[in-house]
Each structure stands twice: as C-alpha cells, then as structure tokens.
C-alpha cells in the first residue's frame, strides 16, 4: 500500500469539528496541526471520534508536550484520557479541583482503572494532604475510594475532611484502617451533642476502643447489632453485661442471633453465666458460677 | 463486553429502501456512541453515520437519504435507508464504543446488494 503521508487537498483541519470524524486515521495523522487541537481541546469531548482516532489525537499531543500535557489540556480531555496510560499521567501536574472532576466525569458509574487510580494519586500527592473538597469529590465518585487508602495514607487526612465521610464510604474498611480515622472522627464531632454525636461517628465505631464504648453505653445511644457486630473484639471483651445491655437498648434482644459469632461468641466466654442469664436471652457459654476468672495478661504485664 | 448482531440486509432495486436493524446486548449501560459502516469490495471499511447522545451525524453520500436511530428501550440501533443507489451496495457493520473500557465492538455485518 502506498504510504499516505501528505494531506489531501481541501482536507486541511481550520478548527477541531465533527467533519473530522469522516476522516481516515492517516488524514488525521495528516491533516490536523497538534497545535489547534491543543487550543481547541475542549471541542474534541463533543465529536463521536472513535477510540482509533482519538489515539491519533493523542499521538499528536504526544509530540507537542513530551515532557507532559498542561493542565489546560488535560482539563478538556473528556474521552481521551481513557487513551491515557499511568505512565502519561504520571508526568502531569494536577493541581485544580475542576480538572480531576472533569476527568473522574469520564467514567463515571465504572470501577476506579489504573488511570483514574494514578491521577488521583498525583493530585493527592501535589496537594499534599486529603483535604475536605477533595474527598467530597473522590467519595463521590468512587464511594470506596477511602478505603483503598492504607492506614499510613489515611494519616495525612485532616480531621475536618472528615465531615465529609458518608457510612457507605466506610462499607470496605478493615480494622486497621478504622482505628487510623475513628480518632479523626473523634475531634472532628467532639464538640456535638449526645445524639447528633452518635448518628455522626457511629460508622467509625469499627475503630472505638473500650474507654469510648462504656462511655457511650452511659448514653442511651440504643447501638443497632450491625454496629456491634463491626466493633474491635478486643474493645468488646471487657464491656460488661450491663454495659452492653445499655449500649444496645431495645437490640440487646439480637445477641441471641449473633450468640455464634464473633466479637458476640468471644464476649459471652468473657461473662459470668449468672449476668448473662439476667438479659433473658437464653445466652449460654458463660463462665459457670462459681469459677474464679484470672487475668493472665494482667499477671504478665506486673511480672 | 457488549454483543451486536445485526439483520435487515437484502437485495433491494435502485429507489427502493431498506431498514438495517442492530441489536446490542450485554453492558450497553457503557455504551458511548454506536454507528454504521460499510465496505464495498476491494475498499476500505467506511463511516456511514453515527449516534451520539442525542445527536446524528452523516457522510455526505448518504446525508438527506439515510436516517440512523436507536431505541433506548429495545437495546437497538437503526438505518433506515431511502432512494437507494447501486453504489450503496457493501457489506454494512454495526459499531459500538464503551465508556470504562474504552474499546470497539463490532457485528458480523449484513449484505446489501442495490441492483440497476
């Protein structure tokens, strides 16, 4: 096949339109200067170009920025920054809050790809800390976004980004990264009411430890069994039976379901028969009456 | 991975029309724009028209006699071709990208032989 290099008469692109999706992926090669398509980058969001062409089209601005786009460019890239590999992105600057949203626009309603993963990495990285409109932004999108941080990336987020965690943001969390942003929720809601406080940091419970819970078992919060079954086991071990009958309220009745599972099963073990058998629940494996309980750990730590 | 199949080809006199038919399925919820193409023997495979959102776009051969649709509902995309011409005689493909993946997919494509 000849090779088809030059331009065809009458062919030359004036401006970035939808004529252009006619063209061959050679004439685009040929015909569109890399120059116009940077200026007139917002444009290119508009026209169906396939995924060939827009290839073409980022061959181009390839050329023209070797050292990486600018952030005008990368703004209006819509579409094509799925054409986008890490490695492109990782030369970028991204510093404004528009352009990431512009750019997690483009899959919306898709997993988080190793592109949008890399973009949002550079531009956390660039601000330097996980602010408040940054996680808005990122939770909005990706609802588990959070939670694929490790516990030493959830350091760096400030207390008051907190505020704007919803619970399902938190569904995919594990302990170690519950107890990292249970302290930040702590003091983001310190200065709440009772109730209001409890709603508010009742999805950070996961990372609570036992000084927090007896407290709040002193404020009629009636936890719900979903709650207590996420709690840290060894934070539920030394509530008491009164304790954890005032926590849950109304749901003390769920142990009865959960009296298998865990930190239920664990902390039955923990408690005289006699006082689990004051909930009237039928729960059994309690330490028969009688029975004197050592605290071997306790004996280690004064040894 | 999104599945298309297209029907409705045949032959047909010059003047008469034809309405080619492409049924999609699997993740169409990703689906960014679906368009119709067509290859004449010995050429290259060429862009008839295009949907994207709510609109159309056509090459000049075909504008003001082809007509391209889709129906949301049934998953399906149209071309409705009018006042056909010898010359529109070609192996027609329906084509679709995705958002997220960011790929192609194409059908086995119909014949549509326009005689004089």
């Known amino acids: 096949e000849v090779e088809k290099t030059a331009c065809p008469s009458g062919k030359k692109a004036r401006e970035i339109d939808e004529s252009l999706i006619f063209y061959k992926k050679w004439e685009l090669e040929a015909c569109v200067d890399a120059a116009l398509l940077a200026t007139q980058m917002d444009r290119v969001n508009a026209i169906p170009f396939t995924y060939e062409q827009l290839d073409v089209l980022k061959h181009k601005l390839d050329e023209l920025y070797p050292q990486g786009y600018p952030e005008s460019v990368i703004q209006h890239l819509g579409y094509l920054f799925l054409k986008m590999s890490p490695e492109d992105i990782r030369k970028w600057n991204v510093t404004s809050l528009e352009t990431l949203k512009a750019l997690l626009e483009v899959n919306k309603g898709h997993e988080m790809s190793p592109q949008v993963a890399t973009l949002i990495d550079r531009f956390v990285k660039g601000r330097g800390q996980l602010d408040k409109d940054t996680l808005d932004t990122l939770t909005a999108f990706y609802p588990g976004y959070l939670c694929s941080l490790s516990p030493e990336e959830l350091s760096s987020v400030p207390p008051s980004s907190i505020w704007a965690v919803r619970p399902q943001d938190l569904d995919t969390c594990d302990p170690r990264q519950l107890d990292v942003l249970y302290p930040k929720a702590r003091l983001a809601f310190q200065n709440m009411n009772g109730s209001e406080y409890f709603v508010k940091i009742q999805s950070f419970l996961g990372g609570a430890p036992t000084e927090d819970l007896k407290a709040l078992s002193q404020q009629n919060v009636s936890m719900d069994l979903a709650t207590f079954m996420k709690l840290r086991t060894d934070a539920v071990l030394p509530l008491t039976v009164a304790e954890v009958q005032k926590l849950l309220g109304p749901h003390v009745e769920g142990l009865k379901a959960e009296e298998r599972h865990r930190p239920v099963r664990d902390w039955i073990l923990r408690q005289r028969q006699d006082d689990l058998d004051t909930l009237g629940l039928g729960l059994q494996g309690g330490i028969p009456n009688g029975y004197l309980v050592l605290d071997l750990s306790m004996q280690e730590a004064l040894s | 991975q999104v599945q298309l199949v297209e029907s409705g080809g045949g032959l047909v006199q010059a003047g008469g029309s034809l309405t080619l038919s492409c049924a999609a399925s699997?993740?169409?919820?990703?689906?960014?724009?679906m368009r119709w193409y067509r290859q004449a023997p010995g050429t290259e495979r060429d862009l008839v028209a295009v949907?994207?959102?709510?609109?159309?776009y056509y090459a000049d051969a075909v504008k003001g006699r082809f007509t391209i649709s889709r129906d949301n509902a049934k998953n399906t995309l149209y071309l409705q071709m009018n006042n056909l011409k010898p010359e529109d005689t070609a192996v027609y493909y329906c084509?679709?990208?995705?958002?997220?993946?960011?790929?192609?997919?194409w059908g086995q494509g119909t014949q549509v032989t326009v005689s004089s």
């Open positions: 084509n679709a990208d995705t958002i997220g993946t960011a790929r192609d997919y």
């Open positions: 949907i994207y959102g709510s609109s159309t």
């Open positions: 699997g993740s169409t919820f990703s689906i960014r724009a």
